[in-house]
Amino acid sequence: PEPPTACREKQYLINSQCCSLCQPGQKLVSDCTEFTETECLPCGESEFLDTWNRETHCHQHKYCDPNLGLRVQQKGTSETDTICTCEEGWHCTSEACESCVLHRSCSPGFGVKQIATGVSDTICEPCPVGFFSNVSSAFEKCHPWTSCETKDLVVQQAGTNKTDVVCGPQDRLRA
């Protein structure tokens, strides 16, 4: 019979024949032959392979180094790598999360639009007219100016993006 030019899913072509790939969590020891099946071996502890494969070496689990602010989000297995994230108050510097940096704070005049997570930094936005922020914070949103009218008071000092309005009593008409 003609040797195959393509193989089924979870197979690979070698020496003009189709061999079974090794399942996730196992590595290739020897290719199949006309008489024998593919030989696979489980990955060692702290190693993994996450696909059907013909790899002769397993990959090492990622180390979530606490000295870099990292912690484990998902423990590695024979079929999956360890997933790292950052300690509270920190976020990853890259998608691979190999190190962490402190969450940015939003300066006075800016509020938090989106609170940081283990993988994304704080997103700040300028406080629009009618809102203010007088602190540097990684959590505080812009606060609305106080409404003097609802307290039967009048604006004595206008608000800014960094300060609230100052309310005062209404001037009484003298008799």
Epitope: P24, G25, P42, C43, G44, E45, S46, E47, D50, Q60, H61, Y63, C64, R71, V72, Q73, Q74, K75, G76, T77, S78, E79, T80, D81
Partner: antibody, heavy 119, light 113 residues
């Protein structure tokens, strides 16, 4: 037959140090991750530390971080736990446990060694 | 840290009965890569070290009788012992094997009526 035998426990004064050992036999020690887990008198189980088969990966519980050091000697089939700055709350039975590369669970436990921290 | 909550804390039982205990985790124990729930059950008899009973939520360790059944997913898990035997009197601990720090429930103690 898999065997894990802990030793090195005893009475220690607060602030003192102690080094625990766990002698492994009946399996290829260098192929397995290892854990220390403790159990305070009449209490539940508390994970303490982990070391991977090849010494590359080490994790600690926050309660012992900076005070305890896990290590292993694959040539001597022995796991260690160096404990410093001991506190009364470290009083417990300390177990070593094996983690394989398939289940990723603690599949064998030693009998434990008792550490008492008291003045 | 993942908090593991077991209930009840103790159960008074008789031989031959069916026993069910619960374990809840404060976050999902589902590994997104291989779709396995990393929930482990250990059995600890008086004066003995813990013994692995069930891993991946429902897979019995070799040598564990089939009267022990683990079930559940995500955050809610159950251990069932059907036709309870005297030798099953022990404390049963569920454990988060999903992430570090590894955390244990406070245990469910089975006592004879």
């Amino acid at each position: 037959e898999v065997q894990l035998v802990e030793s090195g426990g005893g009475l220690v004064k607060p602030g003192g140090s102690r080094k625990l050992s766990c002698a492994a036999s009946g399996f290829t020690f260098s192929d397995y991750g290892m854990h220390w887990v403790r159990q305070a008198p009449e209490k539940g189980l508390e994970w303490v530390a982990y070391i991977s088969s090849g010494n590359r990966i080490i994790y600690y519980a926050d309660t012992v971080k900076g005070r305890f050091t896990i290590s292993r000697d694959n040539a001597k089939n022995t796991l260690f736990l160096q404990m410093t700055s001991l506190r009364s709350e470290d009083t417990a039975l300390y177990y070593c446990a094996r983690q394989d590369g398939y289940r990723y669970a603690m599949d064998y436990w030693g009998q434990g060694t008792s550490v008492t921290v008291s003045s | 840290d993942i908090v593991m909550t077991q209930s009840p804390s103790s159960l008074t039982v008789t031989a031959g009965e069916k026993v069910t205990m619960s374990c809840k985790s404060s976050q999902s124990l589902l590994n997104s890569g291989n779709q396995k729930n990393y929930l482990t059950w250990h059995q600890q008899k008086p004066g003995q070290p813990p013994k692995l009973l069930i891993y991946w939520t429902s897979t019995r360790e070799s040598g564990v009788p089939d009267r022990f059944t683990g079930s559940g997913s995500g955050t809610d898990f159950t251990l069932t012992i059907s036709n309870l035997q005297a030798e099953d009197l022990a404390v049963y601990y569920c454990q988060n094997d999903y992430t570090y720090p590894l955390t244990f429930g406070a245990g469910t103690k089975l006592e004879l009526k």
